[in-house]
């Protein structure tokens, strides 16, 4: 068999919201994703598992089932969405986030996604994490690739 | 709806103050930071400052420190902005704005007319 | 502060023409986490306030038709509007979202012919 390749393109968007009470940052991030079956035979993309962590804690997580069948020598753009909320011990990010004196509220999420590929029974399993800035102070939609954070130091898997 | 219900115009005396209000409704109203933006007669927009219904922070254009202030009063979602020692130069158009915190603008009241004549 | 410079300062135009607009801010309105622009374009028909047009330097806001179109990045930014309709004259202001004080170019003005 040859390969199914798994490119991590960006954020495609990210919704913010707040709860003042409890102090609370809700982002909605959608990530777009392309799966290319390099194989003359159809693959199916049985799941992704994603998760989002800020400062190394896990502020978000998703799985989707039974996605699509992806054809021979072919490539599907796949857009999932990790509904996130910072709060609790992080909950002095709302102060960040809301801070009325700056309009730029950049903070770096490290996305983590795994896609589930089955074909003739045989199951396969490809992981990648990408750190991205998102700015938690409003919404924001992207151009494919636009929020990329290059860090040298933890590069893409 | 969404409505930013300004004050009436005001004519005053050059070196008085006055206070202009800015009426919200349909929204929460500790939800959205309320901006002002002044316009003088066929001239562009000017930031004037923000305010955070919520705890009352501010943020002003330098240029406005000392003429204006802004203030809130929660309990009749009402915005207000009290402009002092008033000259020719500050007769415009003032504008309230709606924010959802840091995002763009996305509401404007329908402006108040403030004429400074002797 | 971050400086706005629009031009043409007013542009006369027949219905279904194609108009383009400049916009250009004394210092980058990127941020360079996310690599958007922040740069908002307001339309203001006579006599009413402005209203959004484009945020994010490309995004329109809802209800906005499709004819409308941002573009541009860093310091350089262009509002087309690719077929004018009557409702469309007025005065189109850049601003500056980025950071405070929040600016606004002088406008460019929209006429019929």
């Known amino acids: 068999p040859r390969s199914i390749d798994v490119k991590y393109i960006g954020v495609k968007s990210a919704y913010v919201s707040y709860d003042v009470q409890k102090r609370t940052i809700y982002l909605n991030i959608t990530n777009t994703l392309n799966i290319t079956n390099n194989n003359y035979y159809s693959v199916e993309v049985e799941n992704i598992t994603a998760q989002v962590q800020f400062s190394k804690t896990v502020i978000g997580k998703a799985r989707l089932n039974n996605i699509t069948i992806i054809g021979p020598l072919d490539m599907k753009q796949i857009d999932y969405t990790v509904p996130t909320v910072i709060a609790e011990e992080m909950s002095y990010m709302y102060d960040f986030c809301t801070l009325i004196s700056i309009k730029v509220h950049n903070i770096v999420l490290m996305m983590q996604v795994t896609v589930t590929t089955t074909y003739f029974g045989h199951s396969e399993q490809i992981s990648q994490e990408r750190y991205q800035y998102v700015d938690c102070g409003r919404n924001t939609t992207y151009q494919l690739g636009q929020s990329e954070y290059l860090n040298v130091l933890q590069p893409q898997q | 709806e969404v409505q930013l219900q300004q004050s009436g115009p005001v004519l005053v005396k050059p070196g008085a103050s006055v206070k202009m209000s800015c009426k919200a409704s349909?929204?929460?109203?500790?939800?959205?930071?309320i901006h002002w933006v002044k316009q003088s007669h066929g001239r562009s927009l000017e930031w004037i400052g923000v305010?955070?219904?919520?705890?009352?922070?501010?943020n002003y254009n330098q240029k406005f420190k000392g003429k204006a202030t802004l203030t809130v009063d929660k309990s009749s979602s009402t915005a207000y902005m009290e402009l002092n020692s008033l000259t020719s130069e500050d007769s415009a158009v003032y504008y309230c704005?709606?924010?959802?915190?840091?995002?763009?603008?996305?509401?404007w009241g329908q402006g108040t007319t403030l004429t400074v004549s002797s | 502060d971050i400086v706005m410079t629009q031009s043409p300062s007013s542009l006369s135009v027949s219905a279904g023409e194609k108009v383009t607009m400049s916009c250009k801010s004394s210092?980058?309105?990127?941020?360079?986490?996310?690599?958007?622009?922040?740069l908002a374009w307001h339309q203001q028909r006579p006599g009413q306030p402005p209203k959004l047009l484009i945020y994010?330097?490309?995004t329109r806001e809802s209800g906005v038709p499709d004819r409308f179109t941002g573009s541009g990045s860093g310091t350089e930014f262009t509002l087309t509007i690719s077929s004018v309709q009557a409702e469309d004259l007025a005065v189109y202001y850049c601003?500056?979202?980025?950071?405070?004080?929040?600016?606004f170019g002088a406008g460019t003005k929209l006429e019929l012919k």
């Open positions: 704005v709606r924010t959802y915190y840091s995002n763009y603008f996305d509401y």
């Open positions: 349909g929204y929460t109203f500790t939800d959205y930071y």
């Open positions: 305010i955070s219904p919520y705890n009352d922070n501010t």
């Open positions: 210092q980058s309105l990127l941020n360079s986490g996310n690599q958007k622009n922040y």
């Open positions: 994010g330097a490309s």
């Open positions: 601003q500056n979202d980025h950071s405070y004080p929040l600016t």
